[in-house]
C-alpha cells in the first residue's frame, strides 16, 4: 500500500517532520534509515530505522482525584523492517501500572449558618437591589469542601425616587463612501459621519444634560490609490536535478508572477510559484552500524590459577559487544568492541549479610489484566569484604579500580521465616484501562 | 509445562454457526495473551483472532470482522471462538495459541503475527460446504 513519506522523525515527539509526498512505497521511502513514514494522514508515523521502544510516555493522571489509585504509561516500538526485543512488531504499545494519590483525603461538604441582616439599598432613586450573606461555618467544610448554593443573595429594592436621565451619544454612524475608489478625479472626495442623542435621550421630569459635542464630522478622503493593475504567472522554468544521490528527494519548477507585474495594488499572481515532484534514485542509503548492548561479564579469573572466588586475589574478565545493522558502505561503530576491568571474585562465597530496608512499593502486575497487585522487598544484603578497591597490576601501569563480580551466598538471620527475601503485596486501586492513545484521536 | 486443548470442530453448511473451545492447564493463565490461527490445505497460516487480557482490547482479522467474536473465562482458563455466518472459504484447521511473555502489550501488529506465541495447540478442523 503507499504511504506518506517524510524526510525526518522527531525522537521527542514521535513525529513525522519534513513532508516529502505519497504515493510511494514503504520499501521505496525507507530507502534511506533516516526517513520516516505513515500510513494515512495524521496517523501514526514510523521512522525508517530498524525497530525500538521509544520513551516511557509520562504517567497518564491519577484514575481518582482524592484517596488511592492508578495510573497507567506505555511505550512504543517503533521503526520498520525488524522487531523489538526480539519478536515485538513496531506500533506495538508496552503497559506499565502503578499506585497513585493526589490528595489523602476527599473533600467534605460543611453546611450554612443563618443569613445576616439586609444591606441598605445600592441606589438613592429609581430601583436597586439589596444584598444579605451568610457563613459557612455550620459545620466548617474539611479537605477542600465547600458549601452548596450562594453565600450571598440579592433582591429588588425601589426608593420611590425619579432619577434624573442625562443625555448620551450613541456610536458614530459608518463614513459615507468616498465619490471615487481611485485619486485624480474632477471633485474633491469626501466623507462623512453621524451619530445621535439617543443612549439615552435626556428626560424632561427631570431635567437631563443634553449630550456634549456636534453631530455630524466630515474629512476629506486622503491617499487614494491609483487603479489596480492584476498580475499575471509568466511560464514554468526547468526542473532542478534531484538533489540527493540515495533514496527518494524532491525536484522543483519555478515560476515568476511578471506576466504582467501587479502594479497600484493590484492582486498577485493566484496560486504557487514552485511544485515538487519526487524523485527516486532507487539507490539504498547508507545505514551506520550501532552497538548492541553491552553482554555478560565474563567470569572473574585469574591466568594459571584454578579459582581465586573469595579470596583476596585480583583477576581479570571481559565482556564484549555487537556492531549491528551496517549496510550500504555505512559507517563502522565507533569505539571498543572488548571492555576489561580487574575483579575480585565472590562467585558462591558464603557471605555475612543484614536486612536492606523495605524497597519503594514496585509496579502493579499484571497492568492491563484482572486484579492488580504492586509489591515491595526486604533482602538479605551482604556485606562485601574489605579488599584493597585499588591495584597495581602491572609495573608503572599505575593503580586500577577493582569490582567484585559474582553472586555470594548471603546468610541472614530469619525474618518472618524467610531467609533471603521477605515480600508485602497490595492490590492496585481504581484501574484505568489501557487504551491506544493513537486509537483514540480517530 | 502448560497444554492448549481445542474442541468444538466439525462439519457445517454455509450461513451456519461453531463455538470453538481451547482449554489451557497451568495457573497463570489469566495473564497469557490467547490468539486464534487458521490453515487451509496448500496455504500459509493466517491470524484470526486475539484477546490479550480480562481487561484489553480485542483483534479480529478484516476477514472474520463482524461475524467471529473472541472471549475468554479465566475461571475456567478457557479462550471460546464463536464462528457465525460461515463460509466455504472459512474452512481450515483452527490453532489455539498463548504468548506467556512477561510484556504486557497491545498493538494489531503485536498479536497479527505468529511470532510472539510460544505454546500452540495441536489443531481442530472446520468444514464449510457450499
Known amino acids: 500500500d503507499p504511504v506518506l513519506c517524510f524526510t525526518q522523525y522527531e525522537e521527542s515527539s514521535g513525529k513525522c517532520k519534513g513532508l516529502l509526498g505519497g504515493g510511494v512505497s514503504v520499501e521505496d521511502c525507507c530507502l534511506n534509515t533516516a526517513f520516516a513514514y505513515q500510513k494515512r494522514s495524521g496517523g501514526l508515523c514510523q521512522p525508517c530505522r530498524s525497530p525500538r521502544w521509544s520513551l516511557w510516555s509520562t504517567w497518564a493522571p491519577c484514575s481518582v482525584t482524592c484517596s488511592e489509585g492508578s495510573q497507567l504509561r506505555y511505550r512504543r516500538c517503533v521503526g520498520w523492517n525488524g522487531q523489538c526485543s526480539g519478536k515485538v512488531a513496531p506500533g506495538t504499545l508496552e503497559w506499565q501500572l502503578q499506585a497513585c494519590e493526589d490528595q489523602q483525603c476527599c473533600p467534605e461538604m460543611g453546611g450554612w449558618s443563618g443569613w445576616g441582616p439586609w444591606e441598605p439599598c445600592s441606589v438613592t432613586c429609581s430601583k436597586g437591589t439589596r444584598t444579605r450573606r451568610r457563613a459557612c461555618n455550620h459545620p466548617a467544610p474539611k479537605c477542600g469542601g465547600h458549601c452548596p448554593g450562594q453565600a450571598q443573595e440579592s433582591e429588588a429594592c425601589d426608593t420611590q425616587q425619579v432619577c434624573p436621565t442625562h443625555g448620551a451619544w450613541a456610536t458614530w454612524g459608518p463614513w459615507t463612501p468616498c465619490s471615487a475608489s481611485c485619486h485624480g478625479g474632477p471633485h474633491e472626495p469626501k466623507e462623512t459621519r453621524s451619530r445621535k442623542c439617543s443612549a439615552p435621550e435626556p428626560s424632561q421630569k427631570p431635567p437631563g444634560k443634553p449630550c456634549p459635542g456636534l453631530a455630524y464630522e466630515q474629512r476629506r478622503c486622503t491617499g487614494l490609490p491609483p487603479c489596480p493593475v492584476a498580475g499575471g504567472w509568466g511560464p514554468w522554468g526547468p526542473v532542478s536535478p534531484c538533489p540527493v544521490t540515495c533514496g527518494l528527494g524532491q525536484t522543483m519548477e519555478q515560476r515568476t508572477c511578471n506576466h504582467p507585474v501587479p502594479q497600484h495594488g493590484g492582486p498577485f499572481c493566484a496560486g504557487d510559484a514552485t511544485r515538487t515532484h519526487i524523485c527516486n534514485t532507487a539507490v539504498p542509503c547508507p545505514v551506520d552500524g550501532e552497538w548492541d548492548s553491552w553482554g555478560e561479564w565474563s567470569p572473574c579469573i585469574r591466568r594459571n590459577m584454578k579459582s581465586i572466588s573469595c579470596q583476596e586475589i585480583p583477576g581479570q574478565q571481559s565482556r564484549g559487544r555487537t556492531c549491528r545493522g551496517r549496510k550500504f558502505d555505512g559507517h563502522r561503530c565507533a569505539g571498543q568492541q572488548q571492555d576489561i576491568r580487574h575483579c575480585y571474585s565472590i562467585q558462591h562465597c558464603p557471605l555475612k549479610g543484614s536486612w536492606s530496608e523495605w524497597s519503594t512499593w514496585g509496579l502493579c502486575m499484571p497492568p492491563c489484566g484482572p486484579n492488580p497487585t504492586r509489591a515491595r522487598q526486604r533482602l538479605c544484603t551482604p556485606l562485601l569484604p574489605k579488599y584493597p578497591p585499588t591495584v597495581s597490576m602491572v609495573e608503572g601501569q599505575g593503580e586500577k579500580n577493582v569490582t567484585f563480580w559474582g553472586r555470594p551466598l548471603p546468610r541472614c538471620e530469619e525474618l518472618q521465616g524467610q531467609k533471603l527475601v521477605v515480600e508485602e503485596k497490595r492490590p492496585c486501586l481504581h484501574v484505568p484501562a489501557c487504551k491506544d492513545p493513537e486509537e483514540e484521536e480517530l | 509445562q502448560v497444554q492448549l486443548v481445542e474442541s468444538g470442530g466439525g462439519l457445517v453448511q454455509a450461513g451456519g454457526s461453531l463455538r470453538l473451545s481451547c482449554a489451557a492447564s497451568g495457573r497463570t493463565f489469566s495473564s497469557y495473551a490467547m490468539g486464534w490461527f487458521r490453515q487451509a490445505p496448500g496455504k500459509e497460516r493466517e491470524f484470526v483472532a486475539a484477546v490479550p487480557w480480562t481487561y484489553g482490547s480485542k483483534y479480529y482479522a478484516d476477514s472474520v470482522k463482524g461475524r467471529f467474536t473472541i472471549s475468554r473465562d479465566d475461571a475456567k482458563n478457557t479462550v471460546y471462538l464463536q464462528m457465525n455466518n460461515l463460509k466455504p472459504e472459512d474452512t481450515a484447521v483452527y490453532y489455539c495459541?498463548?504468548?506467556?511473555?512477561?510484556?504486557?502489550?497491545?498493538?494489531?501488529?503485536?498479536?497479527?503475527?505468529?511470532?510472539?506465541?510460544?505454546?500452540w495447540g495441536q489443531g481442530t478442523q472446520v468444514t464449510v460446504s457450499g
Open positions: 495459541a498463548a504468548d506467556s511473555s512477561a510484556g504486557y502489550y497491545s498493538g494489531f501488529d503485536y498479536y497479527s503475527a505468529a511470532t510472539p506465541y510460544d505454546l
